[in-house]
């Protein structure tokens, strides 16, 4: 089953995915796609990196983290209800059937219409602990259990700025993380 993340219409959605490069600058190709991970690569690719840089992207989809350090979390800008669905993060580790696949489910909720006097917005995300397994079936990600939902109402940074907060750093070890080498 896919891990679930939530955002509101008009917000930026954040889908976490990390790996630890074997050495600084020793990057692994990564793709993000709309739809569950297929056998090879990603279906309906929205963003792709190679060993050096982001080499393909589509509008509204970007990597806000430091992908050179393995933070390949996807930010989707100004989401609409149509952005709901499953997204695939695939870390293409060289070797024989070494790819790591993560299916993340994005749920978009209608925007709250209550007036807000401040510029702060709500962002609630569940950061699950992930166990990755090497296997030959489609389900190579198993959820061990989610941490409690974390309400970031008090934090003025938006979801796409989470990586800069100490909280996000604490959560990094709980997300979809792969160590290479």
């Amino acid at each position: 089953s896919e891990v679930e993340y939530r955002a509101e219409v008009g917000q930026n959605a954040y889908l976490p995915c990390f790996y630890t490069p074997a050495a600084p600058g020793n990057l692994v190709p990564v793709c993000w796609g709309k739809g569950a991970c297929p056998v090879f690569e990603c279906g309906n690719v929205v963003l792709r990196t190679d060993e050096r840089d982001v080499n393909y992207w589509t509008s509204r989809y970007w990597l806000n983290g430091d992908f050179r350090k393995g933070d390949v979390s996807l930010t989707i800008e100004n989401v609409t209800l149509a952005d709901s669905g499953i997204y695939c993060c695939r870390i293409q580790i060289p070797g024989i059937m070494n790819d790591e696949k993560f299916n993340l489910k994005l749920v978009i909720k209608p925007a709250k219409v209550t007036p807000a006097p401040t510029r702060q917005r709500d962002f609630t995300a569940a950061f699950p602990r992930m166990l990755t397994t090497r296997g030959h079936g489609p389900a190579e990600t198993q959820t061990l259990g989610s941490l409690p939902d974390i309400n970031l109402t008090q934090i003025s940074t938006l979801a796409n700025e989470l990586r800069d907060s100490r909280l996000a750093n604490d959560l990094r070890d709980s997300g979809a993380t792969i160590r290479i080498g």
Epitope: A36, N44, Y56, G95, M97, P138
Partner: antibody, heavy 123, light 107 residues
Framework: EVQLVESGGGLVKPGGSLRLSCAAS????????MTWVRQAPGKGLEWVAS????????YYLDSLKSRFTISRDNAKNSLYLQMNSLRAEDTAVYYC????????????????WGQGTLVTVSS | DIQMTQSPSSLSASVGDRVTITCRAS??????LTWYQQKPGKSPKLLIY???TLAEGVPSRFSGSGSGTQFTLTISSLQPEDFATYYC?????????FGQGTKLEIK
């Protein structure tokens, strides 16, 4: 015009080895995943192995990965399948196929196929 | 492994007939399904990918539908050149697997 031409098939004794080749032309070979699919006489299609653009990632039918090795030489526009410890059940026509690809798609289906090369394993 | 089961295994029809071939997956494969056509002594030809997208150069009388575990290939009006064997293939789970084929013969 896209062309895939397999070679290297033939008659081999059980336990023997063969190396199949696939010469590609008419497209930028290094932009595509490549795949081997086989078809035993009178039977259906069976996926054998696939390889990514630069050869760093390979994928195999589990029962074959200890005996078969897929590789590619992008400088020569060539795909290879090294087959060791061959068995009678490996007898088949072996097809080389190109994974359909553009930047926004995944190469999980095959838009061009070679004519196939017959491998017969028999004593 | 994901099993792909096609029905019928063989089918007799006439030119002009509407024909439907079914492919069932043993588990959810979303829309990750491809259809190929193969004529005797020839290599397979890509017809439809992602369950319903027509490959380049394929006549519009071919169509695909379905998602999850149930898929269909429909030929709206059979032409003489359509008599062949048809295979479905899933590309969701490793290994890639094909259906056993449906042989379409002239009645």
């Amino acid at each position: 015009e896209v062309q895939l031409v397999e070679s290297g098939g033939g008659l081999v004794k059980p336990g023997g080895s063969l190396r199949l080749s696939c010469a590609a032309s008419g497209f930028t070979f290094s932009d595509y995943y490549m795949t081997w699919v086989r078809q035993a006489p009178g039977k259906g299609l069976e996926w054998v192995a696939s390889i990514n653009y630069d050869g760093r990632n390979t994928y195999y039918l589990d029962s074959l990965k200890s005996r078969f090795t897929i590789s590619r030489d992008n400088a020569k526009n060539s795909l290879y399948l090294q087959m060791n410890s061959l068995r009678a059940e490996d007898t088949a026509v072996y097809y080389c196929a190109r994974g359909y690809y553009y930047y926004g798609s995944s190469p999980n289906y095959f838009d061009y196929w070679g004519q196939g090369t017959l491998v017969t394993v028999s004593s | 492994d994901i099993q792909m089961t096609q029905s019928p295994s063989s089918l007799s029809a006439s030119v002009g007939d509407r024909v439907t071939i079914t492919c069932r997956a043993s588990e959810n494969i979303y829309s990750y399904l491809t259809w190929y056509q193969q004529k005797p002594g020839k290599s397979p030809k890509l017809l439809i990918y992602n369950a319903k997208t027509l490959a380049e150069g394929v006549p519009s009388r071919f169509s695909g539908s379905g998602s999850g575990t149930q898929f269909t290939l429909t030929i709206s009006s059979l032409q003489p050149e359509d008599f062949a064997t048809y295979y479905c293939q899933q590309h969701y789970g490793t290994p890639l697997t094909f259906g056993q084929g449906t042989k379409l013969e002239i009645k």
